[in-house]
Interface confidence: medium
């Protein structure tokens, strides 16, 4: 009976040993699979993250396009309304002009002497830009970049004057240090009577004959409202 029990124990040990080996093999297999699954999950996660990022970028880009489209549509519908109506109000900016804070701005890409630039703007029923705030200064500066550009400020008849009658003394100023200096040392005859934005945006007085770029500005009429989008 004892030998029978020993035989059974041997059998059980063998079975258990097989079971252990088999279980170990399965655990090993599972851990390998687990590693694969983990890697796969990581890969899927990063793919998902990339897709989300792409989607987010596409969404932002689409939003910009939609915004631009709405703006263009509003501008076009406004101009259509202006053409169809017979009122004398200027309710929206013309094509190629930039609207900002109820004014329209046009930025030249060529150069003219100050008087010619002034004349050009007047022939657009507008005037050389008149800067009335730091906010407007930043807006204009952003559009012209680091390029000498005429503005609607001069002292050709004595005191400094804005072309639209805005008071110079009490108004916004952004001169470079030690400017205006009415410098005579340029050898071109006379002093410096016309103001321009310099490469850093601050103002300088210069010889009015220099062929600088310029900015025209015209105000939208006070009573005007944005037309509904059709």
């Amino acid at each position: 009976q004892n030998s029978q029990l020993q035989e059974e124990l041997r059998g059980l040990r063998e079975t258990f040993s097989n079971f252990t080996a088999s279980t170990e093999a399965q655990v090993k297999g599972l851990s390998t699979q687990g590693g694969n699954v983990g890697r796969k999950m990581k890969s899927l996660e990063s793919q998902l993250e990339k897709q989300q990022k792409d989607l987010s970028e596409d969404h932002s880009s689409l939003l910009l396009h939609v915004k631009q489209f709405v703006s263009d549509l509003r501008s076009l519908s406004c101009q259509m309304a202006a053409l169809q109506g017979n009122g004398s109000e200027r309710t929206c900016c013309p094509v190629n002009w930039v609207e900002h804070e109820r004014s329209c701005y046009w930025f030249s890409r060529s150069g003219k002497a100050w008087a010619d630039a002034d004349n050009y703007c007047r022939l657009e029923d507008a005037h050389l830009v008149v800067v009335t705030s730091w906010e407007e200064q930043k807006f204009v500066q952003h559009h012209i970049g680091p390029v000498n550009t005429w503005m609607g400020l001069h002292d050709q008849n004595g005191p400094w004057k804005w072309v639209d009658g805005t008071d110079y003394e009490t108004g916004f100023k952004n001169w470079r240090p030690e400017q205006p200096d009415d410098w005579y040392g340029h050898g071109l005859g006379g002093g410096e009577d016309c103001a321009h934005f310099t490469d850093d945006g601050r103002w300088n007085d210069d010889v009015c004959q220099r062929p600088y770029r310029w900015v025209c500005e015209t105000e939208l009429d006070k009573a005007s409202q944005e037309p509904p989008l059709l």
Epitope: L83, N86, V95, S110, K112, N119, Y120, E124
Partner: antibody, heavy 122, light 107 residues
Amino acid sequence: EVQLVQSGAEVKKPGSSVKVSCKASGYTFTAYGINWVRQAPGQGLEWMGEIFPRSDNTFYAQKFQGRVTITADKSTSTAYMELSSLRSEDTAVYYCARKGREYGTSHYFDYWGQGTTVTVSS
Amino acid sequence: DIQMTQSPSSLSASVGDRVTITCRISENIYSNLAWYQQKPGKAPKLLIYAAINLAEGVPSRFSGSGSGTDFTLTISSLQPEDFATYYCQHFWGTPFTFGQGTKLEIK
């Protein structure tokens, strides 16, 4: 349809004044500049000046400065050109013309009136 | 003021000919130039604006070229109705000067 219709022919004495009208129709009068151009017999075209009816801003050629006055009546969509101190050399056909596209970098005269003959003779 | 020199002042040509009229400007006016056609007793008619753009309703045999100081009006194949006087005009500040004109006559 855009149309510019001018007043009829005039015969004037030297030293007097003439006022020519130009009635616009078919578009928003205040949205475009109106220009005046003259042409003496057998001669070329000569620009005289411009008005923006929206703002009443005017521009005149140096040659006519002080003798010419351009005005606009928004209520009747009519532009006027008055030339004073007339001389025999002012005998010409006077045209009004719409300046196409009030804005942007390139302009042009896209519509013209039929012309008004002004004869200055004693 | 800007000076305009249009040439030739007169020109004889036949139906079917290719004709070129030039306009030279005293300073750079970029593309701010228009061309007009005028027939006797009539108001001028816009042909080309902004140097190269064909005005509405103008036949495609008319074309404009150039920028800066030198501009050209070309008629590729003259038609009987094209015999008239042609003018260039600049729009680079006032005065909006016209060229002296080119009279195109039948040979």
